[in-house]
């Protein structure tokens, strides 16, 4: 190889060992019989050399640095050439570096021809291996503007006081043009301006200077977004840190065309604007940091540009002004991430503050709209607390657990509506009465309705799940001793049509000691399956549950248990079951940790089943499943 650099070209070529590979055979640059590991060629020099191996690209890299001095004379503006031409260089991974020095008052603009650039974060790499690393200067300090790949939106970067641009090309890459030009501009009075152009739908992830390290103190950086007028842009902050400010406040400022309040100032922790039509600017302003403990300011954000959806022009009013202790969250439903571009799905408050999830609280009327291509990507979760603090006031009081119609009218599917029902300890208990009798969900007879009620204890220390219940069964009411949460969970969009079937009334009743009592009035047509609470995890220690099972006059009930033994092993205490005839008070007691479970038994009158647990050893829990079937009486035994 021969490299000859013209005098006054201000070019230096450096060939050096790259990252060491585990190749056994070393490789050297051979120059006038000598083996050397590095070769530096300066302007005006001509050097002939070879490599001692067949694949020098596995060992060496080449750096070509051109210093451009705009301080002492005119600046060579225009398209930047690759010098020396790549065809004259050995086929090594090569980095072309242009180091432009200019006065503080002069603005320099890097213009990137198509394909534009896409910024990448730490640890990321470019698919084709071609990277652009751009840095600026503040006095003597180098500031990293960012590392970029091809095929993005960044079209121009403006800086002042100087710029260093490094273009890295893999040895096999055929590129022979720099792909950018330099122009002079008036002073930009800030660290830099990055212009990002969207032709159509798409997204761009951008970062503050020096990311992930700290943004320079008290500096200003601006991103200009060029967005076709018919599209909408939304900004979301992916990652940010705030430094410790002594004076001034760190903030972002938006210049949004058509806004009457330009610039719009936001804190970094605020929800950022969305649903913006056309071009806009975003600026990051640092502060004077505390000298002792400066901290770091850094920001990584995403701009998503997409077509406005039909829904984006529709305003929905969610009136929670008459509600108390209620919150409504609209959020993305969990999905597998796809690799292709997915338009954003945002919910907007007052059409401007858009984010992927939004929580509305009671006491106000809210206006919301959607910026989303497919509203099935969102769902709603609602929480409402009904609490009784004074047992004298609450006793016998009833509340309807019903989803408000305002919420049902929203174009987003309801996932969960949870009521937290709180009572004064040891003073009151609760009874749930459904509008339609409930069926308990079991493997043997699963619910196939569009919604279910999930009933669980709301006492933090207590792990007690009563079960999942849906309309169309035999459970007339559920009485519970203490605080519970009742969650209406929907399973199909058809819930909107079936919403009329929902309806549950909660009443505060005098305190009782059992954890739960289920009142069951079986229908003659079907088999009722019932199971102990906390199925699969076992009834909690020392917990007692009862079923009050009604048997009509002309029917006989068959009580069947689905295993021979309960399987419980007690550490302390005894686990037992009592089956008691309500009319005669006659009862049978079974030791669940010793006896076999009863064979199917027939009951001509209403009866109780009571199950009380001991403190079981781990892994030997109490789980029981039983059924009740009614058949017509053939002989009257009374």
């Amino acid at each position: 190889f021969e490299i000859a650099l013209p005098r006054e070209s201000n070019i230096t070529v450096l060939i050096k060992l790259g990252t060491p590979t585990l190749l056994a055979k070393p490789c050297y640059i051979v120059i006038s019989k000598r083996h050397i590991t590095m070769l530096s060629i300066k302007s005006g020099e001509r050097i002939v050399f070879t490599f001692s191996c067949q694949s020098p690209e596995n060992h060496f890299v080449i750096e070509i640095q051109k210093n451009i001095d705009c301080m002492s004379g005119p600046c060579p503006f225009g398209e930047v050439q690759l010098q020396p031409s790549t065809s004259l260089l050995p086929t090594l991974n090569r980095t072309f570096i242009w180091d432009v020095k200019a006065h503080k008052s002069i603005g320099l603009e890097l213009q990137f021809s198509i394909p534009r650039l896409r910024q990448i974060g730490p640890g990321e790499s470019c698919p084709d291996g071609v990277t652009h690393s751009i840095s600026g200067r503040i006095d003597a300090t180098v500031v990293r503007i960012g590392t970029f790949c091809s095929n993005g939106t960044v079209s121009r970067i403006k800086m002042q006081e100087g710029v260093k641009m490094a273009l890295h090309l893999p040895w096999f890459h055929p590129r022979n043009v720099s792909g950018f030009s330099i122009a002079n501009r008036s002073s930009i009075k800030r660290l830099c301006i990055i212009e990002s152009v969207f032709e159509g739908e798409g997204s761009a992830t951008l970062m503050s200077a020096n990311y992930p390290e700290g943004f320079p103190e008290d500096e200003l950086m601006t991103w200009q977004f060029v967005v076709p007028a018919h599209l909408r842009a939304s900004v979301s902050f992916l990652n940010f840190n705030l430094s410790n400010c002594e004076r001034k406040e760190e903030r972002v400022e938006y210049y949004i065309p058509g806004s009457t309040t330009n610039p719009e100032v936001f804190k970094l922790e605020d929800k950022q604007p969305g649903n913006m039509a056309g071009n806009f600017n975003l600026s990051l302003q640092g502060c004077d940091q505390d000298a002792q403990s400066p901290g770091i300011l850094r920001l990584q954000f995403q701009v998503l540009v997409q077509h406005p959806q039909n829904e984006s022009n529709k305003i929905y009013v969610v009136d929670l002004s008459n509600e108390r202790a209620m919150s409504l969250t609209i959020e993305p439903r969990p999905v597998k991430q796809s690799r292709k571009f997915v338009p954003g799905c945002f919910v907007c408050l007052e059409s401007r503050t858009c984010s992927s999830n939004l929580t509305l609280t009671s006491g106000s009327k809210h206006k919301i709209s959607f910026l989303c291509d497919d509203l099935t990507r969102l769902w709603m979760n609602v929480e409402k607390t009904i609490s009784c603090t004074d047992h004298r006031y609450c006793q016998r009081k009833s509340y309807s657990l019903q989803v408000p119609s305002d919420i049902l009218h929203l174009p987003v599917e309801l996932h969960d509506f949870s009521w937290k029902l709180l009572v004064p300890k040891d003073r009151l208990s609760l009874v749930l009465v459904p509008a339609q009798k409930l069926q308990q969900h079991t493997h043997e007879k699963p619910c196939n309705t569009s919604f279910s009620y999930l009933v669980a204890s709301a006492i933090p220390s207590q792990d007690l799940y009563f079960g999942s219940f849906c309309p169309g069964g035999s459970i007339k009411q559920i009485q519970v001793k203490q605080n519970i949460s009742v969650t209406l969970r929907t399973f199909a969009p058809s819930f909107q049509q079936e919403a009329s079937r929902q309806g549950l009334t909660v009443s505060f009743i005098p305190y009782f000691k059992e954890e739960g009592v289920f009142t069951v009035t079986p229908d003659t047509k079907s088999k009722v399956y019932l199971r102990t609470p906390n199925w699969d995890r076992g009834l909690p220690s020392l917990t007692s549950v009862s079923w009050n099972i009604s048997v009509p006059r002309d029917q006989v009930a068959c009580l069947t248990f689905f295993k021979e033994r309960s399987g419980v092993v007690c550490q302390t205490g005894r686990a037992f079951m009592i089956i008691q005839e309500q009319r005669t008070r006659a009862e049978e007691i079974f030791s669940l940790d010793e006896d076999v479970l009863p064979k199917p038994s027939f009951h001509h009158h209403s009866f109780w089943v009571n199950i009380s647990n001991c403190s079981p050893t781990s892994g030997k829990q109490l789980d029981l499943l039983f059924s009740v079937t009614l058949t017509p009486r053939t002989v009257d035994l009374t």
Epitope: P26, H35, T37, S40
Partner: antibody, heavy 117, light 111 residues
Framework: EVQLQESGPGLVAPSQSLSITCTVS????????VNWVRQPPGKGLEWLGM???????DYNSALKSRLSISKDNSKSQVFLKMNSLQTDDTARYYC???????????WGQGTSVTVSS | DIVLTQSPASLAVSLGQRATISCRAS??????????MNWFQQKPGQPPKLLIY???NQGSGVPARFSGSGSGTDFSLNIHPMEEDDTAMYFC?????????FGGGTKLEIK
Amino acid sequence: EVQLQESGPGLVAPSQSLSITCTVSGFSLTGYGVNWVRQPPGKGLEWLGMIWGDGSTDYNSALKSRLSISKDNSKSQVFLKMNSLQTDDTARYYCARDGYDGAMDYWGQGTSVTVSS
Amino acid sequence: DIVLTQSPASLAVSLGQRATISCRASESVDNYGISFMNWFQQKPGQPPKLLIYAASNQGSGVPARFSGSGSGTDFSLNIHPMEEDDTAMYFCQQSKEVPWTFGGGTKLEIK
């Protein structure tokens, strides 16, 4: 493993000539040069000359007239021949590989040569 | 020929302390972006051992306490912390142009 081993006569009469052989292993003489360095007792190091991988030679100008370096690539041997020895040529003679960036990275143990009648 | 002047001629350093040996060349030994200055350690009855090549690169198997620096005409070898085993003669050597030349040597001892 790279190794160099010198072998010489030990004692040479004044005005006679000296022949030393350097046998190498672990590398090829076509790819690396070999230097000759000597060290008189209690003194410093003096470079004598070298033979490059391509067979060309360079000598210390003060000794060039009575020095000759050659090699046999197939036998992995380098030869030093020095004529008209005097008592001040008494020294330990080393061969050393010319590694990358001009460093003599591997040395032989040396052979002691005494010029005496 | 390039003349190398090594200083000091002898040096005594306490264990754990820093030893610094200097080498000055009569002209620059830089070429192709490399400083062709090497440092050797020699113990009695043994051949020289390469410590540092190209001014600042460690030879293979050389402990990290040996470091070299400099460019152009002024170079130094640093040993820190000094160990018992470091008692030896130290030579600088230039390989920019033939004849290769050595410094006069520095005798390093324990204080």
